[in-house]
Interface confidence: medium
């Protein structure tokens, strides 16, 4: 038989025995001559190197390019393929020789002890046990142990071939520790060598690359990529890498098995690719493929190689961020750069440091955004190598849903005298300002809070029949004034007022404010009484340590038994917007107070005096009077607020400034405190006196120096003082330029 591709110029070597298969007896001599057209060599079984002592290869005496192979006294082990070939080509002629040796029908392997067969537990896979025969037509079976089992060729999936060995589905012998072939000749049994069965796995669970993504390097740096394959037990792995610059001289590949915990159902293999100094041509996709023979899994990552350090903002970097109070705000610094830049955040020019409310890193995170977080945030990226800086400004706008200032004054609201004109107010703070404030009303009796009616926190009113104030049929005549805008506590607020032209009917009024991020509402209980009337003397909110009198005036012909009470500290729980139980129905919550009675021609006046009012005196005061005829009780409630004494503070700072001669300087100094502080100005620690050039306005809040002169230069101090102390701020005014000579000089 001939193998290899025919060549244009060469014929195949010619063998002296023109057969594919030759059968000879043991102990005889095998001699085959091979002739050709150039240098020849022989290969024979068991020894592919040509160093076997018994085998003799000689040059023919009768011609060039001719060699004879001789084996005297052949044995069964000499069975196999004999090949004559041209050196350094694929052109060859082969003959298969059977040496019939009935004493050893199986050809022994080179190592005469045992062999190893590797199998997988795959139903579809077969395994070949290489027990080759020196006789072609033997009856061969396969023995597996332990427990012992015998497998006989079935003409289908189990077979024996003298040239190949015993073929059997691998799962049939996967239980076994060892197998061997057995042949019966004339009732004698002959056994091949033992083969140890090794069950190998093939499943690869995953292949992981590390780093897995975002690999960036600069020219000359070292790239190290680790590829880890996790497999079932008894698996062998071959790694294969694909990368952009395959001809890299600094490339290094190291493969090794990783230790896993004992009892683990898994094996780990690691392949490490190292390129010592990357170049631009190393940029690209790196793929690691792990193969177990039956299965291949791969993973890829992109490696970016930069020519030089750089930093830039990514296209997705925001310039405006909008948020609502209380939300968590995240402003990521989106950048492109190598190496990763240092990131610094500034707010209105001041560096931001991380704390429990704000995290200033790759992402600026404000945990619970508040109004004061509104402003311009600058992020500065610095390339740590080149020191190149890039900056970007992000404007943060914080929206505030409508907040109604008076809503915090939850109390059994004041009663209103029958027939009087009253103004109800809702002061709304919202960002952006509310796009509308609407008023609604309903009759008090339609919504009486009777004990029998269940009132929940979420729905404090048993009835929700709110009517628009335009429809005041059956109620009080109403007029809604145009919204006013006022600066209150340094905030721009919207004030909506509802004027009740004549207080005839007890009702509930609701104002509702809406802006783009939410809504707010306030319910006002407008209780109309024909009973007593409360006034406050002096008519203002007292400050701590001031004296105040509460006057209760009632018509003597109608009322008797005037009494002052204070509402206890823990009345029935009142929820936001909930209507309280009428105080006259619940005297248990009242504390009786000492008061002085005065009378004039028509009225009784009961005066309750508070000397040196304290914060503890705040609360709801009730005047109770009894109808002389019906004996029905009438209650009027008045809320008293005592303002806390606050030491002076000055908001804002005076700035040092430089001005040219002849120009004007205008500065303001806003002070707060209770009692309100007096503001005074000093220059170089001496009281500043008003003259034609120095003007003080708005209770000394604003200082104007007109047509400044050189002598106006100096240290200016604004001082705000009250009985509780002083606060001051200072600034240095520098006056530049030469003084012009006047005609007088």
């Amino acid at each position: 038989a001939s193998v290899g591709l025919p060549s244009v110029s060469l014929d195949l070597p010619r063998l002296s025995i023109q057969k594919d298969i030759l059968t000879i007896k043991a102990n005889t001599t095998l001699q085959i001559t091979c002739r050709g057209q150039r240098d020849l060599d022989w290969l024979w079984p068991n020894n592919q190197s040509g160093s076997e002592q018994r085998v003799e290869v000689t040059e023919c005496s009768d011609g060039l390019f001719c060699k004879t192979l001789t084996i005297p006294k052949v044995i069964g082990n000499d069975t196999g393929a004999y090949k004559c070939f041209y050196r350094e080509t694929d052109l060859a002629s082969v003959i298969y020789v059977y040496v019939q040796d009935y004493r050893s029908p199986f050809i022994a392997s080179v190592s005469d002890q045992h062999g190893v067969v590797y199998i997988t537990e795959n139903k579809n896979k077969t395994v070949v046990i290489p027990c080759l025969g020196s006789i072609s037509n033997l009856n061969v079976s396969l023995c597996a142990r332990y427990p012992e089992k015998r497998f006989v060729p079935d003409g289908n999936r189990i077979s024996w071939d003298s040239k190949k060995g015993f073929t059997i589905p691998s799962y049939m012998i996967s239980y076994a520790g060892m197998v061997f072939c057995e042949a019966k000749i004339n009732d004698e049994s002959y056994q091949s060598i033992m083969y140890i069965v090794v069950v190998v796995g093939y499943r690869i669970y995953d292949v992981v690359l590390s780093p897995s993504h975002g690999i960036e390097l600069s020219v000359g740096e070292k790239l190290v990529l680790n590829c880890t394959a996790r497999t079932e037990l008894n698996v062998g792995i071959d790694f294969n890498w694909e990368y952009p610059s395959s001809k890299h001289q600094h490339k290094k590949l190291v493969n090794r098995d990783l230790k896993t915990q004992s009892g683990s159902e898994m094996k780990k293999f690691l392949s490490t690719l190292t390129i010592d100094g990357v170049t631009r041509s190393d940029q690209g996709l790196y793929t690691c493929a792990a193969s177990s023979g039956l299965m291949t899994k791969k993973n890829s990552t992109f490696v970016r190689v930069h020519e030089k350090p750089f930093v830039a903002f990514g296209s997705g970097m925001e310039s405006l961020v909008e948020a609502t109070v209380g939300e968590r705000v995240r402003i990521p610094a989106k950048y492109l750069g190598y190496p990763p830049p240092e990131i610094k955040w500034y707010k209105n020019g001041i560096p931001l440091e991380s704390n429990h409310t704000i995290k200033a890193g790759h992402v600026l995170t404000i945990m619970e955004v508040s109004e004061r977080d509104t402003g311009n945030y600058t992020v500065i990226l610095t390339n740590p190598i080149s020191k190149e800086k890039q900056s970007h400004v992000v404007s943060l706008v914080v929206y505030v849903p409508p907040q109604i200032g008076e809503k915090s004054l939850i109390s059994p609201v004041d009663s209103y005298q029958y027939g009087t004109t009253q103004t109800l107010t809702c002061t709304v703070y919202a960002i952006p300002p509310p796009h509308h404030i609407h008023w609604y009303w309903q009759l008090e009796e339609e919504c009486a809070n009777e004990p029998s009616q269940a009132v929940s926190v979420t729905n404090p009113y048993p009835c929700e029949e709110w009517r628009s104030v335009e429809d005041f049929q059956g109620g009080n005549k109403i007029e809604v004034n145009k919204n006013q805008f006022a600066l209150i506590e340094g905030k721009n607020k919207t004030v909506s007022t509802l004027v009740i032209q004549a207080a005839n009917v007890s009702a509930l009024y609701k104002c509702e404010a809406v802006n783009k991020v939410g809504r707010g509402e306030r319910v006002i209980s407008f209780h109309v009484t024909r009973g007593p009337e409360i006034t406050l003397q002096p008519d203002m909110q007292p400050t701590e340590q001031e004296s105040v009198s509460l006057w209760c005036t009632a018509d003597r012909s109608t009322f008797e038994n005037l009494t002052w009470y204070k509402l206890g500290p823990q009345p029935l729980p009142i929820h936001v917007g909930e209507l309280p139980t009428p105080v006259c129905k619940n005297l248990d919550t009242l504390w009786k107070l000492n008061a002085t009675m005065f009378s004039n021609s028509t009225n009784d006046i009961l005066i309750m005096e508070l000397k040196n009012a304290s914060l503890q005196d705040q609360g709801d005061y009730v005047c109770l009077a009894q109808d002389r005829k019906t004996k029905k009780r009438h209650c009027v409630v008045r809320q008293l607020t005592v303002l806390e004494r606050v030491a002076p503070t000055i908001t804002g700072n005076l700035e040092n400034q430089t001005t040219s001669i002849g120009e004007s300087i205008e500065v303001s100094c806003t002070a707060s405190g209770n009692p309100p502080p007096q503001i005074m100005w000093f220059k170089d620690n001496e009281t500043l006196v008003e003259d034609s050039g120095i003007v003080l306005k708005d209770g000394n809040r604003n200082l104007t120096i007109r047509r400044v002169r050189k002598e106006d230069e100096g240290l200016y101090t604004c001082q705000a003082c009250s009985v509780l102390g002083c606060a001051k701020v200072e600034a240095f005014f520098i006056i530049e330029g030469a003084q012009e000579k006047t005609n007088l000089e």
Epitope: V219, K222, K308, P309, K344, I385
Partner: antibody, heavy 126, light 110 residues
């Protein structure tokens, strides 16, 4: 741990040039910047310039602009500082120093001379 | 003339706390981090504080740094005789595109 090893002391005449070397051993040359800093007798530390070996780019202090050349040989992991038109005021100890490149706190980059050479004394005298 | 300003000398007795100040401008300390170096004559300078207030491993916690606006300070508590040395502050300057040092402060332990 990387070490910076500098060449030995030099004595030079005014108007001549000096070339001091600084070899990095025991670490990756990588993308660290290497600066040169000098200290004249009785004076403080003075920064001269820096080179980023991996990119071969250098920048110099204005005081030395045009007189100093800082180069790097990537194959031998060696930096060189050459100062020309020497004058007696250039008598000083010349140091090479590595700018560290470690991250810390997630967003801040540690920027400091964490490894210094042992120094090279250059004397300029007629 | 050094770009960063340091007092030429400082002193203290053993156990005392000493503070060395370093003043700069918005282009250096104002926009970059400050480092402090310890220098003994005849040896290479050694990094003492980096990134305003961070200590490299091996530097005792007696040394602390801080920065506010365009100035920085180095505080040494529990002063020891071994602390006698020159101390330098340094920062990157964006305008000069380079490192700038202070003139150095010679610390004497009395």
């Amino acid at each position: 741990q990387m070490q910076l090893v500098q060449s030995g002391a030099e004595v030079k005449k005014p108007g001549s040039s000096v070339k001091v070397s600084c070899e990095a051993s025991g670490g990756t040359f990588s993308s660290f910047a290497i600066s040169w800093v000098r200290q004249a007798p009785g004076q403080g530390l003075e920064w001269m310039g820096r080179v980023i070996p991996v990119f071969g780019t250098a920048n110099y202090a204005q005081t030395f602009q045009g007189r100093v050349t800082i180069t790097a040989d990537k194959s031998t992991s060696t930096m060189f500082m050459e100062l020309s038109s020497l004058r007696s005021e250039d008598t000083a100890v010349y140091y090479c120093a590595r700018e560290s490149g470690d991250y810390y706190d997630g967003s801040r980059y540690v920027d400091a001379f964490d490894i210094w050479g042992q120094g090279t004394m250059v004397t300029v005298s007629s | 003339q050094p770009v960063l300003t340091q007092p030429p000398s400082a002193s203290g007795t053993p156990g005392q706390r000493v503070t060395i100040f370093c003043s700069g401008s918005t282009s250096n300390i104002g926009s970059n981090t400050v480092n402090w170096y310890h220098h003994l004559p005849g040896t290479a300078p050694k990094l003492l504080i980096y990134s305003n207030n961070q200590r490299p491993s091996g530097v005792p916690d007696r040394f602390s740094g801080s920065k506010s606006g365009t100035s920085a300070s180095l505080a040494i508590s529990g002063l020891q005789s071994a602390d006698e040395a020159d101390y330098y502050c340094a920062a990157w300057d964006d305008n000069l595109n380079g490192w700038v040092f202070g003139g150095g402060t010679k610390l004497t332990v009395l």
